[in-house]
């Protein structure tokens, strides 16, 4: 008996061939021996089987002795043995229809689990192997689970169902809902305008939800909500914003926040959360602000940074075009009785300058100038 595998929702064509290359009488029946379709001369006739409105044949092939049964919009319950009767012969074809679906939705939040469920006909014992867009293989039976979805899991998952040495391939598009970056850090000199951007790693037709930015200033004992906003069809509207600092927010995606001035009291870390409509859970992006200030008070030139810096960052004070006078893995450095000239305060990571602030030291009879 020939075995044919089909996919739920697809169309399958079961072949039936006569030795005579001409149109002769044929019938397709199901395992109950109830007629699905057949011919009466050049006319296609249909019996009362459940396939009645989804079954067809190709009249153009009848003259060549080919009498296919075409079943559209396959259902799992179409799995059956189909019998073609032609020239006093019976050809049997076993059709097995499989379906593969993702749990609830194909749009999942980063960190959530993806469950793929195989629908299969009774009596079948298929095996399934799926390959993720990043090349990871998972195997299973009726269900396959992937926990802690990552951004790289977005894309087309290719799943192969094996039964009776035959295989059928499913492609499922999975969208992992996440921000492009889990965390970002902004380095600014005191007084500069700060731009925070929160680009999404996915595109959808309509995006609706609400969000909030909580901020934990380094100097503050507790975190506070800086801004809350709504998102409706990719349009952003601010609901509530603190007076200090008075953040501004862009009206379009990507989510964009502007802090008018970088001040030491704002240095710290924030957590932007976005709750999407019809989704349980939230998207998160951490954002950090490091603020630098260089000052000269009497005979002391000081450079300070506030905010979340890594212990391996180096803070240096140097006179322009000269070797560093002081260089430490600390958040503040100073030079006593600095020479006149343009001093640079540098925050660097393995030689790469992250933040730079210049201060002009005048001869001792003058006051300092900060360009």
């Amino acid at each position: 008996k020939k075995v044919v595998l089909g996919k739920k929702g697809d169309t399958v064509e079961l072949t039936c061939t006569a030795s005579q290359k001409k149109s002769i009488q044929f019938h397709w029946k199901n395992s109950n021996q109830i007629k699905i379709l057949g011919n009466q001369g050049s006319f296609l006739t249909k019996g009362p089987s459940k396939l009645n409105d989804r079954a067809d044949s190709r009249r153009s092939l009848w003259d060549q002795g080919n009498f296919p049964l075409i079943i559209k919009n396959l259902k799992i319950e179409d799995s059956d043995t189909y019998i073609c009767e032609v020239e006093d012969q019976k050809e049997e074809v076993q059709l097995l229809v499989f379906g593969l679906t993702a749990n609830s939705d194909t749009h999942l939040l980063q960190g959530q689990s993806l469950t793929l469920t195989l629908e299969s006909p009774p009596g079948s014992s298929p095996s399934v192997q799926c390959r993720s867009p990043r090349g990871k293989n998972i195997q299973g039976g009726k269900t396959l689970s992937v926990s802690q979805l990552e951004l790289q899991d977005s894309g087309t998952w290719t799943c192969t169902v094996l039964q009776n040495q035959k295989k059928v391939e499913f492609k499922i598009d999975i969208v992992v809902l996440a921000f492009q970056k889990a965390s970002s850090i902004v380095y600014k000199k005191e007084g500069e305008q700060v731009e925070f951007s929160f680009p999404l790693a996915f595109t959808v037709e309509k995006l609706t939800g609400s969000g909030e930015l909580w901020w934990q200033a380094e100097r503050a004992s507790s975190s506070k909500s800086w801004i809350t906003f709504d998102l409706k069809n990719k349009e952003v509207s601010v609901k509530r914003v603190t007076q200090d600092p008075k953040l501004q927010m862009g009206k379009k995606l990507p989510l964009h926040l502007t802090l008018p001035q970088a001040l030491p009291q704002y240095a710290g870390s924030g957590n932007l959360t976005l709750a999407l409509e019809a989704k349980t859970g939230k998207l998160h992006q951490e954002v950090n602000l490091v603020v630098m200030r260089a000052t000269q008070l009497q005979k002391n030139l000081t450079c300070e940074v506030w905010g979340p810096t890594s212990p391996k960052l180096m803070l240096s004070l140097k006179l322009e075009n000269k070797e560093a006078k002081v260089s430490k893995r600390e958040k503040a450095v100073w030079v006593l009785n600095p020479e006149a000239g343009m001093w640079q305060c540098l925050l660097s990571d393995s030689g790469q300058v992250l933040l730079e602030s210049n201060i002009k030291v005048l001869p001792t009879w003058s006051t300092p100038v900060q360009p």
Partner: antibody
């Protein structure tokens, strides 16, 4: 034992729409085809059409342009609408369950029938 | 559509008689034929399917034969409770079609 009960107005005016409902009791409406058949006085039985629980239908070509069948699985009911009726549509209307088995396709459970008269 | 022609349209027989009804299809319907019994004022009841197979609970005095286009329904020994109308119905093709019916009466 599954039982079927037809309900609907016994009198319909010409050119109006005949509406009947069949309620399935003591059993599920799921996974069967359900047919409507009518019988005019002194005449044979005429198959009007059938509906599957998924909503898929097959109608008799002679009535197709006027027939609509619907199914409501939550209420265990299916219905028939026949538009633009004339006196020729006066008949006893039956609902029945179609059953498929090995070599078998027949209406094994019937309602008791409801008489519909088309008259002004 | 497949036309089903039944004959006779009515008959009268005595209790114990052998009663035969014929049904002819306009096209070959293989064995896809049902026979129904309808008692006065009641809904039809399926007696035989696939031309000759008895439905569960139906007395063995009812039988059927035939294939293709010509079919016969027989009551070997007519009983008083057998009065009513007998109809054939094909299920080879949609639309399902019925014969005109044969009314059986007791003499």
């Amino acid at each position: 034992q599954v039982q079927l009960q037809e309900s609907g107005p016994g009198l319909v005016k010409p050119s109006e729409t005949l509406s009947l409902t069949c309620t399935v009791s003591n059993g599920s409406i799921s996974s069967y085809y359900w047919s409507w058949i009518r019988q005019s006085a002194g005449k044979g039985l005429e198959w009007i059409g059938r509906i599957y629980t998924s909503g898929s239908t097959n109608y008799n070509p002679s009535l197709k342009s006027r027939v609509t069948m619907l199914v409501d699985t939550s209420k265990n009911q299916f219905s028939l609408k026949l538009s633009s009726v004339t006196a020729a549509d006066t008949a006893v209307y039956y609902c029945a369950r179609d059953r498929e088995d090995y070599y078998y396709y027949g209406m094994d459970v019937w309602g008791q029938g409801t008489t519909v008269t088309v008259s002004s | 559509d497949i036309q089903m022609t039944q004959s006779p349209s009515s008959l009268s027989a005595s209790v114990g008689d052998r009663v035969t009804i014929t049904c002819q299809a306009s096209h070959d319907i293989s064995n896809y034929l049902n026979w129904y019994q309808q008692k006065p004022g009641k809904a039809p009841k399926l007696l035989l399917y696939y031309a000759s197979n008895l439905e569960t609970g139906v007395p063995s005095r009812f039988s059927g034969s035939g294939s293709g286009t010509d079919f016969t329904f027989t009551i070997t020994s007519l009983q008083p409770e057998d009065i009513g109308t007998y109809s054939c119905q094909q299920y080879d093709n949609l639309p399902l079609t019925f014969g005109g019916g044969t009314k059986v009466e007791i003499k």
